[in-house]
């Protein structure tokens, strides 16, 4: 088999063998090496010499195999846009951001650019759990049987109704989706409106 061409090598059809790590240089009609993440082109390739790469300066990065002659400026996560930092910028990776707690991504352009406050879920509901935090606004779902949630909140979870017997008490009023069971001491009289149901 023929030996694999090593950059720089001639290319008649303007395409290179390894699209990720090589690029077509039209002036010389050759394929040259791209620079790896964390580096940039310090000297362009020629017919007899491949691309020379150098490490990105402090406060800058290049994320991909590239033929940039400069690196990108590290930028912070913008708190006014509701973003917070989860990992600082390195020479190979831009600052990693996510939505602040209680927020979701409202604008996406390759990455999240703007977060907004999650909507409240009303009493009797809770936010459906998502695979990824901050990915979308709340979708409120009713509490399942035997559970309640009594606030308007973006994050409150439905809780199981109190079982009065577990506490040595008896049920005075049943729980609903919006309120917990009301318990009372078994020796206490029932409220007047319920006394007619008792055997004398």
């Amino acid at each position: 088999s023929q030996p694999q061409a090593v950059p720089p090598y001639a290319s008649e059809n303007q395409t290179c063998r390894d699209q990720e790590k090589e690029y077509y240089e039209p002036q010389h009609r050759i394929c040259c090496s791209r620079c790896p993440p964390g580096t940039y082109v310090s000297a362009k390739c020629s017919r007899i010499r491949d691309t020379v790469c150098a490490t990105c300066a402090e406060n800058s990065y290049n994320e991909h195999w590239n033929y940039l002659t400069i690196c990108q400026l590290c930028r912070p996560c913008d708190p006014v846009m509701g973003l917070e930092e989860i990992a600082p910028c390195t020479s190979k990776r831009k600052t990693q951001c996510r939505c602040q707690p209680g927020m979701f991504c409202a604008a996406w352009a390759l990455e999240c650019t703007h977060c907004e406050l999650l909507s409240d879920c009303p009493p009797g509901t809770e936010a459906e759990l998502k695979d990824e935090v901050g990915k979308g606004n709340n979708h409120c779902v009713p509490c399942k049987a035997g559970h309640f949630q009594n606030t308007s909140s973006p994050s409150a979870r439905c809780q199981p109704h109190t079982r009065c017997e577990n506490q040595g008490l008896v049920e005075a009023a049943p729980g609903t989706a919006q309120s917990d069971t009301t318990c009372k001491n078994p020796l206490e009289p029932l409220p007047p409106e319920m006394s007619g149901t008792m055997l004398m």
């Epitope: 940039l68 400069i70 690196c71 400026l73 590290c74 930028r75 912070p76 913008d78």
Partner: antibody, heavy 120, light 113 residues
């Protein structure tokens, strides 16, 4: 030495469009973000948007979104700014500018400016 | 967008005297991970494009006379001309590059008293 040379002055009617060019020389055009900044008579500087030619991605100030289009032609090392639905308030000097230390850092190099007059 | 506010709007200073221009940003432009302030100062003379004077809030661009200095951090910044010269008559602008949506102050006009 990096130079940004802009197209000549334009006089336009309200409601029409203008396209201003910015030709770069003396540096690697495609690796630097080109910004467009305008200055109305007697007013301050206002960033309109920018483009990174090698990525082909443009980003615009909210104020101009939908009315401005920024493009770049890597083969001629030229960036373009087109502003549509012109009104008298768009009368200004339009500058292109680019960084030198970083792909998208502070603006070191500026074009000479293009005067656009919008008048009926 | 980050709003930049300069004070005063104009300033008249005698030759050889100190001129001080203030700039306030609506949010911090300090990036805690690298402890750098993403703020630049520009000088613009009539009929000319702006000229970069200072970046990273306090680093002078090469060729800029050392009478120009920048200071401040977070949201409050100052440009100082220690001894005003006739050629310093111009409008001065602060600008943030903390976000890729650059914004400028409204400008401060410096004149000779």
């Amino acid at each position: 030495q990096v130079q940004l040379v802009q197209s000549g002055a334009e006089v336009k009617k309200p409601g029409s469009s203008v396209k201003v060019s910015c030709k770069a020389s003396g540096g690697t055009f495609s690796s630097y973000a080109i910004s467009w900044v305008r200055q109305a008579p007697g007013q301050g500087l206002e960033w309109m948007g920018g483009i990174i030619p090698i990525f082909g991605t443009a980003n615009y100030a909210q104020k101009f979104q939908g009315r401005v289009t920024i493009t770049a032609d890597k083969s001629t090392s030229t960036a373009y700014m087109e502003l549509s639905s012109l009104r008298s308030e768009d009368t200004a000097v339009y500058y292109c500018a680019r960084p030198s230390y970083y792909l998208d850092g502070w603006l070191d190099y500026w074009g000479q400016g293009t005067t656009v007059t919008v008048s009926s | 967008d980050i709003v930049m506010t300069q004070s005063p709007d104009s300033l008249a200073v005698s030759l050889g005297e100190r001129a001080t221009i203030n700039c306030k940003s609506s949010q911090s432009v300090l990036y805690s991970s690298n402890n750098k302030n993403y703020l630049a100062w520009y000088q613009q003379k009539p009929g000319q494009p702006p000229k970069l004077l200072i970046y990273w809030a306090s680093t002078r661009e090469s060729g800029v006379p050392d009478r120009f200095s920048g200071s401040g951090s977070g949201t409050d910044f100052t440009l100082t001309i220690s001894s005003l010269q006739a050629e310093d008559v111009a409008v001065y602008y602060c600008s943030q590059y903390y976000t890729t949506h650059y914004t400028f102050g409204q400008g401060t006009k410096v004149e000779i008293k």
